[in-house]
């Protein structure tokens, strides 16, 4: 015999006041042990016959032939209740005095022993024939995870006895195990949404909802896949799961329609050089589709040109690009556009940017070098190179002079202001060759060096002189 009922009390002494199995004399007060104990039973008393309705033992041994069989009494097989209700059930067994060795009753669920803090107690009812043992189990506020097959185990004379299972079925509202997920879709292109909910109780039926309206006229058995043939505007989808206990509604998910991106904003110039501009931007809204690449459009702003636009393509990230091969000291209009799988955004607002002065593109001309031995100096002269406007304003010259003699090498340079085209350099080493090169300097930088001009510096009081125009490369003029 066994009992199962709903209960509200929480006091342990009130938990198990239902009818008890077996023949129990009224003068015997039971004593109880918590589930976790493995106490031995009280000393056996007089033998008694085995109750008629029992579960058959699952293990046999040679010794068992000498003793009457012992098994758990039949109990309730299936308990159905709603979530958050309380439940209690029990196993009971009658042990005749002829059994000398018994261990406590353990509770198992779905093949695993229930250890730890469970609401369970074991009660013993001894009489002259033996002892009746009742193992009581309770669950307060049942949850779905409490669903399963519960049974008792006990060792008697080293033989394991297992009770019939008590199947606990916790019923509640449908529970979602798969809800629809937000997706971004191409306009008028089919896509799928999935919804799956479970009981118990089963079956669970699904209704799909789009923008608060049901889209299936009849319910679908869970799981349900909704194929939407295409949307032209953003929609919100959810699914309703119905079973005999009621209705659960999934989260609502936005299905967005992919569109072209918004134009980039905040186009800024981070740095300019004579021939490059470093531009940054903030991407616009991506149109629900990742940006794939961006295009930087550049046109000359201050020319009566044909309006041709240079286009530079770059990856969408980082939002930065160095535009190169530009003219020095020029004004440009710059805009940015980005694309996703749907197409290109409109261009950003155009911004103005300027390159800085360039360095000179040609070297000084007609370089001559004379040795003034009396003053022990080199007299260097040149003519100003033809500097274009975009090369910037001439600020001076750099003179490189390299001195070489047996075992000695000296490389020196001087900078002179733009006033004049003449300089004097003290002789560094006698009995040596001096190689002179000159470059023009503007605010934009230093230009190319002239071809080298060589002069031989004799020992003291011997004069060799080497005038020169800019010679061909590798030419050495000396006298």
């Amino acid at each position: 015999g066994g009992t199962a009922e709903k209960w509200e009390e929480t006091e342990l002494d009130q938990l198990f006041s239902g009818p008890l199995p077996g023949r129990l004399p009224v003068n015997h007060r039971p004593f109880s042990a918590p589930h976790s104990s493995r106490d031995q039973l009280p000393p056996p008393q007089t033998g008694r016959s085995h109750p008629a309705h029992t579960a058959a033992p699952q293990v046999t041994s040679t010794a068992s032939k000498l003793l009457p069989p012992v098994a758990f009494n039949h109990t309730i097989g299936h308990i159905v209740l709603s979530e958050h209700k309380n439940v209690k059930f029990n196993c009971s067994i009658n042990i005749p005095n002829t059994y000398q060795e018994t261990a406590g009753i353990s509770w198992w669920k779905d093949g695993k022993e229930l250890l730890g803090a469970h609401h369970s107690i074991t009660q013993f009812y001894p009489d002259e024939e033996g002892v009746s043992i009742i193992a009581l189990f309770s669950i307060a506020s049942v949850q779905r995870s409490d669903n399963g097959s519960y049974f008792c185990k006990m060792k008697v004379n080293n033989r394991e006895i297992v009770s019939d299972p008590i199947y606990v079925e916790v019923q509640g509202l449908p529970y979602f195990i798969k809800q629809p997920e937000s997706v971004n879709v191409t306009r008028n292109t089919a896509f799928n949404l999935t919804c799956q909910a479970v009981g118990p109780p089963e079956p669970v039926n699904i209704f799909w909802v789009q923008n608060s309206s049901r889209v299936n006229e009849k319910p679908e058995r869970s799981p349900s896949v909704l194929t939407v043939p295409g949307l032209t505007e953003t929609a919100v989808f959810s699914c309703e799961a119905h079973n005999d206990k009621g209705l659960t509604v999934s989260k609502g998910v936005h299905i967005n329609i992919k569109v072209i991106p918004s134009p980039p904003t905040e186009v800024h110039i981070l740095n300019s050089t004579a021939h490059s501009i470093l531009v940054s931007w903030v991407p616009g809204f991506d149109g629900y589709s990742p940006l794939q690449n961006c295009s930087i459009q550049v046109k000359e702003a201050d020319r009566l040109s044909n309006g041709s636009v240079m286009v530079f393509n770059t990856s969408a990230s980082p939002h930065l690009y160095e535009i190169q091969q530009l003219q020095a000291l020029a004004n440009y209009s710059i805009a940015v556009s980005c694309r996703n799988e749907i197409g290109w955004s409109a261009v950003s607002p155009w911004i103005l940017a300027s390159t800085t002065e360039g360095a000179p593109s040609v070297a000084p001309l007609n370089i001559t070098v004379f040795l003034n031995e009396s003053n022990n100096i080199l007299d260097i002269r040149w003519t100003k190179p033809p500097i274009k406007r975009q090369d910037g304003e001439l600020v001076g010259y750099r003179i490189s002079h390299v001195w070489e003699s047996a075992g000695t090498y000296k490389e020196l340079s001087e900078e002179v202001s733009q006033n004049g085209s003449w300089a004097q350099i003290p002789v560094q080493i006698h009995n040596a060759t001096c190689t002179v090169r000159i470059a023009a300097i503007t605010k934009g930088g230093i230009g190319p060096f002239s071809e080298p001009v060589n002069i031989i510096i004799p020992e003291h009081s011997k004069v060799d002189y080497a005038p020169s125009s800019t010679p061909a490369p590798g030419n050495t003029d000396s006298m």
Epitope: W208, V215, N216, E217, K218, E220, P229, T232
Partner: antibody, heavy 120, light 107 residues
Amino acid sequence: QVQLQQSGPELVKPGASVKISCKASGYAFSSSWVNWVKQRPGKGLEWIGRIYPGDGDSNYNGNFKGKATLTADKSSNTAYLQLSSLTSEDSAVYFCARKSHFIYYTLDYWGQGTPVTVSS
Amino acid sequence: DIVMTQSHKFKSTSVGDRVSIACKASQDVGTSVAWYQQKPGKSPKLLIYWASSRHTGVPDRFTGSGSGTDFTLTISNVQSEDLTDYFCQQYSTYPYTFGGGTKLEIK
């Protein structure tokens, strides 16, 4: 593949009734609506009504109430259209057609049509 | 009942041309519109549903567009087998209603 096989041509007398059938295969018969459509010679298409075999739910075009009765037998995957009190106006080809229970979809597969001729 | 009007009972075209067939609903039907092709002595065949979705196996030269009350079936690169009857249908509200049909014929 989805197929709707209709019964053969019918020649009936005015005032009589006729019951034509539509046997479905290749899909879950119980969970799609079976619709019936009338087409008179040289005319357009006229929707008669529909039935949901899963639960017997049905809807009718008001013009056919009292004229048409829709039924379905889940065990044989067959839907039926019964026309009563026939007149020459009922001479037409009658089509059955499937519709999913999702609102996006419409009559995606059709039977071959059953010609009904009402003549004395 | 919602009335579906196909203004052209006949429409002339040539093989290889692009042709459009119009259909107008008497009230807003959203995108719950289908297009069917019917050849003589045959049952209608679904081409387009949900105003612009092509049914399985329908060649991509058939395109549907529109929403609300105005709908168009466009056939690009018309083939000789396309020269037949076309019907529009609304399935937004009961009873479902069909247009009167447009016969596509050779110029």
